[in-house]
């Protein structure tokens, strides 16, 4: 059954006509107009863009649009004083120089204000030593090094390679293997797909072409001074040594032409294996330091950033409801860009206002969503997720009555091969429901429906004849909501074929080559990847705010937490004698699953039978629905982790990107045969199987009739 | 080998056209952007036109905008550029060369130049 | 455009004498700067590319610096092949300039 006959939701002909009113041309022109110069939060251009679709999204309809402004820690290049990298010899002088900036595109070589390239929150310091070469810098690399490799990192320079995992990880590993510095760099192994031209002739990254973006550890906090509050006028500021997730040695930068003249000087230890291996025409030594003849030359960092309380605006728009005003479905998507922003993030801004201006012409006509949609433009996204985070802060206690969903908004494509999406189970019958009845743009599947091509490209790897759907993890705007106040969440945006391209990312994330003509020209010429991505995000919000009964399913949550449960009874028996020494059970755990199972089935049972003619049986019913992600969380929040408060999920220890299940118990399952005090450490994975025992079963019984 | 021949350069009335070929061998021809480069009589040198592997993609120093179009035929390794509405100060040596970075040039390969001449 | 200003003109050394040619950018080019040799009815020949890196082929007393705005050529103790014009040009955006060019001559 489709959503529609499943719940008796909006008539067909209403969200037909939501659809009907998205146009490809339109999302052009609002990703044009976006892109023309660069949207740096803090800056002017930013405040302006901010008030430009203030004035937009009133035109166009919503009932009330307006500024909410934050002064937090932002970070910015010294404009005088240019940060760079060095090779100097043993007189000091400097026998090679890192680039400054990256080589404008043809088109943009008169744009001011383009911001070089620069690891943000970087302390200053001009650290110079020996270079070690730490590949991705995960865990496991580090693991590597100085186990296995016996490599000390302690006083050295390390230079890892983006991605794999998230740039603050890294970094954070890196200081806890004692390094003085990190430089960071695109290696074409990750960054250029093979047969594809570099830009502007492709979409693959030039040698001189380099990554942006923050190196925070904040673990869910929002503004480094401001945790848990709103950085508003009259807030308590930290001081700088306090601030959360701040790195603490320098941090830069650089693209794979400097990379190279680093690299291929590199003595030391060969790598341990091909997987240690880019793209280079080098030997990706280890190290440390240079090989002979350049032995007795050195790394030096020159680091000049300077962290600034800078004024940041969101835009919250708000589309009334006209029969639970008080249930908010919210649509949120960032502003602010490194650079241009040509695909991060305002491919998904330009989606966003076309969502925002559909909607409008509807209310126009005189139609209104049952429940209230609130619309955000975010301000630095890309310093840390901090405009999101201040404005949930500042309204935590409205969206923990009232926050029914929260549909992100960033980048609507990073590839143009299939969907993606990430969200909470609940929503999983929603998004399989509303993309049956959409038509693919892929080639090859003409009059198909999205399901069909995207479950053909990306099947789910338990379930046949049904698409892959992955856990929420972070790095983007949802996190506030889904990890820290428990709304039920969800992304989607076009992505590349993982098979085939196992880069990461996009080549161009984040450089100042992600223009307009990267999207225009090569991404999608017709912009039939972003307007079916309009529809997914657009038709989610319609069927959320419109539903008579939330189009949640609780008992594709009931499956997950079982498949959750096996997985990490799995890790844990991989420890059979010290499970059986120091007493450790998963039964709790296996059996609070077992009764959200069942009572989740009866609640599904209830919810097609109940009189839905009755608004306080309709409303007990919804608000148990909406209540069951809130469920899942734990007020006191994950070990030294107070922001990620959900049970069932959040960000991995070792990648912000990715989603962990059971976080509490995989963290204290993990490297668990290094520890120091054993007894210690069993005695806390038997604590978090207890409180994740006690947060399913308190869960289920939300769902429990209530009298 | 990397070999670049120029030829066409000639002496030329004020206002009147030119072509100019440039062979290419010794290289992938079609995996180069390529440009002309000139240099005056008093040694100044000045890029001119660039276009990208493909040919689909031009770029022209303001002095040549609208009156130069630079061109190529991949299939005969050939570089060219049609010259038009000719000036006095289009007089120069006209070299091809190959960039040596996609569309950030800079130049290891020149050929040996030809001579155009506009006179009054 | 970005004017690159080259200084001096012209320099007159005895071989064996160090020398150092400056170009200056009307702008920040970065390290997106490279400095050619042309000698009399010959075609100019890439020296160093990038501010500092070493061409294959060409004679280690060549080398490079500066950064930003301001760039130097150093020749370290002259030979008698070495005399002609010297020319920087930059790839940082188009159009691709050159400097006017310094000539070296035998005093």
């Known amino acids: 059954k489709s959503s529609n006959e499943a719940t008796n939701i909006t008539p067909k002909h209403n969200m037909k006509a939501f659809l009907d009113e998205l146009k490809a041309e339109n999302i052009k022109k609002f990703l044009y107009n976006f892109t023309q110069i660069p949207h740096l939060a803090g800056t002017e251009q930013n405040f302006q863009l901010a008030k430009q679709i203030q004035s937009q999204w009133k035109e166009f309809g919503l009932d009330s649009v307006e500024l909410a402004h934050y002064d937090v820690l932002l970070s910015y290049p010294n404009k005088t004083h240019p940060n760079y990298i060095s090779i100097i010899n043993e007189d000091g002088n400097e026998i090679f120089n890192t680039s400054l900036f990256e080589p404008p595109p043809p088109g943009y070589e008169n744009v001011s204000d383009i911001v070089p390239p620069f690891s943000a929150f970087s302390p200053q310091g001009m650290p110079e030593g020996d270079l070690v070469y730490v590949n991705y810098a995960r865990t496991e690399d580090f693991f590597k090094l100085e186990r296995d490799m016996k490599i000390n990192c302690s006083g050295k320079i390390v230079i890892a390679r983006y991605g794999k995992v998230f740039r603050g990880n890294k970094v954070k590993n890196a200081q806890l293997a004692g390094a003085k510095g990190v430089i960071l760099y695109s290696d074409p192994a990750d960054y250029f797909a093979p047969g594809v031209k570099s830009y502007p002739d492709g979409w693959n990254l030039p040698g001189g072409g380099v990554q942006r973006g923050n190196i925070l550890n904040l673990n869910g906090a929002g503004d480094p001074l401001t945790p848990g509050y709103p950085a508003n006028e009259y807030a308590y500021r930290r001081g700088i040594a306090e601030a959360v997730g701040l790195p603490s040695i320098p941090v830069h930068p650089i693209g794979y032409y400097d990379a190279q003249k680093l690299l291929e000087k590199m003595g030391g230890s060969a790598p341990p294996d091909s997987s240690w291996r880019g793209s280079l025409k080098v030997p990706y030594n280890v190290g440390p330091g240079f090989t002979g003849n350049f032995s007795t030359q050195k790394v030096k960092m020159h680091i000049h950033s300077t962290n600034e309380v800078t004024r940041i605006y969101n835009v919250i728009g708000t589309l009334r409801g006209a029969v639970e005003p008080d249930r908010y479905v919210i649509l949120g998507g960032h502003r602010d860009s490194w650079v241009f922003g040509g695909i991060d993030p305002q491919s998904g801004a330009a989606v966003v206002h076309e969502i925002v201006r559909s909607f409008g012409t509807l209310k126009k006509e005189g139609w209104r969503p049952r429940r209230t949609i609130l619309f955000a433009s975010w301000d630095a996204e890309e310093f840390g997720l901090l405009g999101s985070t201040e404005w949930a802060e500042e309204n935590s206690r409205l969206l923990q009555e009232r926050g029914v969903a929260y549909i992100n908004a960033d980048s609507s494509i990073e590839g143009n091969y299939t969907l993606r999406v990430d969200c909470t189970p609940l929503m999983y019958s929603l998004v399989h429901n509303l993309t049956k009845e959409l038509k693919s743009p892929d080639e090859g599947f003409e009059g198909k429906s999205l399901y069909e091509s995207w479950t053909k490209k990306s099947p789910s790897p338990e379930f046949s004849g049904m698409p892959r759907i992955s856990k929420l993890g972070s790095g983007n705007d949802f996190e506030v909501f889904f990890q820290r106040l428990g709304i039920a969440s969800g992304r989607a945006r076009y992505t590349k074929n993982w098979e085939t391209n196992k880069f990461s990312g996009y080549p161009l994330y984040h450089s100042v080559y992600e223009t307009y003509e990267l999207v225009e020209k090569f991404y999608d010429p017709m912009f039939k990847y972003h307007l079916t991505v309009a529809q997914v995000r657009g038709g989610m919000v319609f069927e959320l705010a419109n539903s008579i009964v939330l189009p949640f399913d609780c008992r594709d949550y009931a499956v997950v937490l079982r498949k959750y449960a096996d997985k990490i009874y799995s890790i844990s028996m991989k420890h059979p004698q010290e499970m059986k020494t120091y007493s450790v059970s998963f039964d709790s755990l296996f059996s609070a699953v077992k009764n959200f199972t069942e009572i989740a089935s009866k609640f599904s049972e209830r919810l097609q039978d109940f009189d839905k003619s009755n608004p306080i049986v309709l409303r007990m019913m919804n608000d148990q629905l909406m209540f069951l992600e809130r469920a899942f969380i734990d007020p006191l929040g994950l070990p030294d982790r107070p922001f990620y408060r959900h049970v069932i999920y959040a960000p991995s220890s070792h990648n912000k990107y990715a989603g962990e299940s059971f976080p509490g118990i995989y963290d204290a399952l993990f490297d668990i045969e290094s520890k120091v005090d054993p007894s210690k450490a069993w005695g806390e994975v038997k604590r978090q199987i207890y409180v994740a025992a006690f947060t399913v079963q308190a869960a289920a019984e939300t769902l429990s009739e209530v009298a | 080998d990397v070999k670049l021949v120029e030829s066409g350069g000639d002496l030329v009335n004020l206002g009147g056209s030119l072509k100019l070929s440039c062979a290419a061998s010794?290289?992938?021809?079609?995996?180069?952007?390529m440009s002309w480069v000139r240099q005056t009589p008093e040694k100044r040198l000045e890029l001119v036109a660039a276009i990208n592997s493909d040919g689909d993609n031009t770029y022209y120093t303001d002095t040549v905008k609208g009156r130069f179009t630079i061109s190529r035929d991949n299939a005969k390794n050939t570089l060219y550029m049609q010259m038009s509405s000719l000036k006095s100060e289009d007089t120069a040596l006209y070299y091809c060369a190959r960039h040596e970075d996609g569309y950030w040039a800079w130049f290891v390969y020149w050929g040996q130049g030809t001579l155009v001449t506009v006179s009054a | 455009d970005i004017v690159l200003t080259q200084s001096p003109a012209t320099l007159s050394v005895t071989p064996g004498d160090s020398v150092s040619l400056s170009c200056r950018a009307s702008?920040?080019?970065?390290?997106?700067l490279h400095w050619y040799q042309q000698k009399s009815h010959e075609s100019p020949r890439l020296l160093i590319k990038?501010?500092?890196q070493s061409i294959s082929g060409i004679p280690s007393r060549f080398s490079g610096s500066g950064s930003g705005t301001d760039f130097t050529l150093s020749i370290n103790s002259v030979e008698t092949e070495d005399f002609g014009m010297y020319f920087c040009?930059?790839?940082?955006?188009?159009?691709?300039?050159f400097g006017g060019g310094t000539k070296l001559e035998i005093k």
């Open positions: 040009q930059q790839s940082n955006s188009w159009p691709w300039t």
């Open positions: 702008q920040s080019i970065s390290n997106h």
């Open positions: 010794g290289f992938t021809f079609s995996g180069y952007y």
């Open positions: 990038f501010v500092s």
